[in-house]
């Protein structure tokens, strides 16, 4: 930002009103008036070029320093060419000297040269030659000097003429300030420029109304240079939640809009399924029946729990059930749907029911399922089972109601035994089987049925309480169809699948395990 100049003295704007002192009195410097552009132009002039040694002083009024540390002195003046005077005026000069003196009080008309310190010799860039002067084309020079640091209450400037033909048209004394500034939503106060050229005054900014320094961010700071310019901005402020940046200010979000954190982003429109927000909202409340999960961003629409799984089937396969379902028709507006399966078993005789999680086995953990099917095994025969599939999403925990569907299935048979061939010979087959331990207590005996492959007219049956049997008196090199079925008090359980086992040919010797 451009530096601000604070004027302490302006001769052109006040003329004789300032009451400058000339020394010696009545000689040397003289106050005159010209008219230029419809305005009286005042000047102090001196032109004693023919009179030998000159020492003419012009002292300003006492100038109150105020808060200035370094002052700038701008001079506008004309100097006539010494050659434009007869004989080149041997004592003629084309420069004058600029002095200053600091003091804590106004000495009035008491002028003492010894108190003054020389700032510089002022020389013109252009001198006014005779032809220009006669044509009233004077060459105006502008020179600027600076002095600092100043420490006393006020100061004088003085101009020493040593024999030049000079007209002083403007003397402007000012100091520089870095102007009041709004940047990065921070306000920086008007600040006096320092007095030392290399130094930069660090100035802390304050966030404008409804703006804050972001967490972990730097406090706003700027540097005020000697020339009154702001440099090197550091840090910034951001509009707080509920407010957005409009030009250099933070404005409350309009009704129906919100902003949930301090950021550079504008206010956002309230998402779906929210109530219209008031002015300056940091979030938008959910409509009745809609919710926001703790981890949901405020910009996300409000959602609700899903409806129940749409369609649930329970297909029994012996002591196993495959549960299948389709996703809820209404997802509640969310994609994070998971399913939970629970199981209840009832004894038909007593009608007594209880949870069966401990006695059954699921093909995958029954809670937090993302797939839409699961297989439940190790079910007990002659038992009624009710399976509940509940659909849940990220906001289900915010309501007490549940969305579920149930399916019941009666297990009338044991699970088919798993059969394997333990050994064989030319005339025998050794067979073993297993069923899930929970079902074993209900089995009275096992029935092994076998016959030659291709002979549908006759079959043999063997019963045993154990889990294996050796079938003897078989024909060599012959394939037999073998099935094992559990017998319970209530009747037959599910039969195993029919296995094909072959006896050894006579060339093969011994009892070989397969």
């Amino acid at each position: 930002a451009q530096g601000k100049e604070v004027v302490l003295l302006d001769f052109a704007a006040a003329g004789g009103e300032l009451g400058w002192l000339t020394h010696p009195y009545g000689k040397g410097w003289d106050l005159m008036q010209n008219i230029m552009n419809d305005m009286p132009i005042y000047m102090y002039s001196v032109c004693n070029v023919m009179s030998g040694d000159q020492d003419n002083w012009l002292r300003t009024n006492w100038v109150y320093r105020g808060e200035a540390e370094r002052i700038f002195i701008e001079l506008k003046f004309t100097v006539r060419d010494c050659n434009s005077f007869p004989g080149g005026a041997s004592s003629c000069k084309e420069t004058f000297n600029l002095y200053y003196a600091e003091s804590d009080l106004d000495y009035g008309t008491n002028f003492q040269k010894r108190l003054f310190t020389k700032i510089d010799t002022i020389a013109p860039d252009e001198i006014t030659v005779s032809s220009d002067f006669e044509a009233r084309h004077v060459k105006l020079n502008v020179e600027e000097r600076s002095v600092g640091p100043l420490t006393r209450k006020g100061f004088y400037l003085a101009f020493q003429d040593i024999g030049a033909c000079v007209a002083l048209l403007s003397v402007r004394v000012y100091y520089k300030k870095c102007p009041e500034l709004l940047q990065g939503l921070a306000h920086f106060p008007e600040t006096i420029a320092g007095s030392d050229a290399p130094s930069l005054a660090t100035v802390a900014g304050t966030c404008v109304d409804h703006a804050v320094v972001p967490p972990g961010g730097e406090e706003p700071r700027m540097h005020c240079a000697v020339d009154g310019e702001w440099l090197v901005p550091i840090g910034q402020c951001l509009c707080q939640a509920g407010y957005e940046k409009v030009e250099d200010a933070c404005q409350a979000c309009s009704p129906g809009f919100f902003k949930f954190e301090a950021s550079e982003s504008p206010c956002l429109e309230c998402p779906e399924h929210t109530l219209p927000s008031p002015e300056g909202a940091t979030s938008c409340e959910c409509e009745e029946g809609f919710f926001r999960a703790p981890q949901d961003p405020a910009s996300m629409p409000c959602t609700r729990p899903p409806s129940a799984p749409h369609y649930l089937t329970a297909v029994g396969m012996g002591a196993k059930v495959e549960l299948r379902w389709t996703p809820p028709q209404d997802s509640g507006g969310r994609e994070d749907i998971v399913y939970s399966v629970t199981c209840e078993q009832c004894w038909p005789e007593s009608g007594e029911c209880g949870p069966c999680e401990a006695s059954v086995r699921y093909s995958e953990p029954p809670h937090g399922l993302t797939r839409t099917s699961v297989t439940v095994s190790d079910l007990e025969p002659h038992m009624n089972y009710t399976f509940t599939v509940e659909a849940r999403n990220g906001v289900s925990g915010l309501v007490t109601s549940r969305s579920f569907r149930t399916a019941s299935v009666s297990i009338n048979q044991t699970e088919p035994p798993k059969v394997r061939l333990e050994g064989r010979s030319t005339t025998s087959l050794s067979v073993s089987w297993s069923i899930p331990p929970p079902q074993q207590s209900r089995v009275w005996k096992y029935e092994v049925t076998y016959r030659k492959k291709g002979d549908s007219n006759s079959y043999n049956v063997r019963r045993t309480e154990g889990f294996s049997v050796t079938l003897d008196d078989l024909a060599p090199d012959t394939t037999y169809l073998v099935q094992v079925q559990a017998l319970t008090q209530e009747g037959q359980g599910a039969g195993s699948k029919v296995h094909e086992f072959q006896t050894l040919s006579p060339e093969g010797s011994g009892n070989l395990a397969v």
């Epitope: 004027v7 704007a13 006040a14 004789g16 009103e17 009286p40």
Partner: antibody, heavy 119, light 106 residues
Framework: EVQLQQSGPELVKPGASVKISCKAS????????MHWVKQSHGKSLEWIGF????????GYNQRFKNKATLTVDTSSSTAYMEVRSLTSEDSAVYFC????????????WGQGTTLTVSS | QIVLTQSPALMSASPGEKVTMTCSAS?????MYWYQQKPRSSPKPWIY???NLASGVPARFSGSGSGTSYSLTISSMEAEDAATYYC?????????FGGGTKLEIK
């Protein structure tokens, strides 16, 4: 004692001209600028221009450049302002005012001349 | 041209009360001048070079300001101070006056 004595009130017809006078006394007439200021009824002040009696140099507010002409008679220490092509807009009190010695304000004022333009 | 805006346009004060009126310039000016005008009288110089009191002006008056903002203050209002006060600048041509602040006694 510095005094500026202005001529009396004027009632003139639209389109005509009028010349108002301001006689100075109590100081060296040629050393000070003489300014003219307009004050419309119940309104603020408007600077018309000035004349430097020493050499007759003048300066005008651009708004009045074609409306007013400033002159002086140094022998009688009198300043004049002629206002031409009068309209009702020119109806006002006109003041002459001495410029502070080589300064930017007006330290002595005449009593004012009321100009009324009416048909 | 520089426009000077005075505020308030009209104000009233009780005897002994402190009074402040302001003059705001459309561009920065180096100095401000103030005049007092009473009904059916010509203006009188009151304050020159921003803060200097003209001859005969009571010490209860003061002027201050810089840049675009200037003010005239009466430390303790008296009946004779009731008048219209005009600010004036001549830092740039043409010289201009403010619209005036009319000060009345309560």
């Amino acid at each position: 004692e510095v005094q500026l004595q202005q001529s009396g009130p004027e009632l003139v017809k639209p389109g005509a001209s009028v010349k108002i006078s301001c006689k100075a006394s109590g100081y060296t007439f040629t050393d000070y600028n003489m300014h003219w200021v307009k004050q419309s009824h119940g309104k603020s002040l408007e600077w018309i221009g000035f004349i430097y009696p020493y050499n007759g140099g003048t300066g005008y507010n651009q708004r009045f450049k074609n409306k007013a002409t400033l002159t002086v008679d140094t022998s009688s220490s009198t300043a004049y302002m002629e206002v031409r092509s009068l309209t009702s807009e020119d109806s006002a009190v006109y003041f002459c005012a001495r410029g502070y010695y080589y300064g930017r304000h007006f330290d002595y004022w005449g009593q004012g001349t009321t100009l009324t333009v009416s048909s | 041209q520089i426009v000077l805006t005075q505020s308030p346009a009209l104000m009233s004060a009780s005897p002994g009360e402190k009074v402040t009126m302001t003059c705001s310039a459309s561009s920065s000016v180096s100095y401000m001048y103030w005049y007092q005008q009473k009904p059916r009288s010509s203006p009188k110089p009151w304050i020159y070079i921003t803060s200097n009191l003209a001859s005969g002006v009571p010490a209860r008056f003061s002027g201050s300001g810089s840049g675009t903002s200037y003010s005239l203050t009466i430390s303790s209002m008296e009946a004779e101070d009731a008048a219209t006060y005009y600010c004036q600048q001549w830092s740039s041509n043409p010289p201009t006056f403010g619209g005036g602040t009319k000060l009345e006694i309560k």
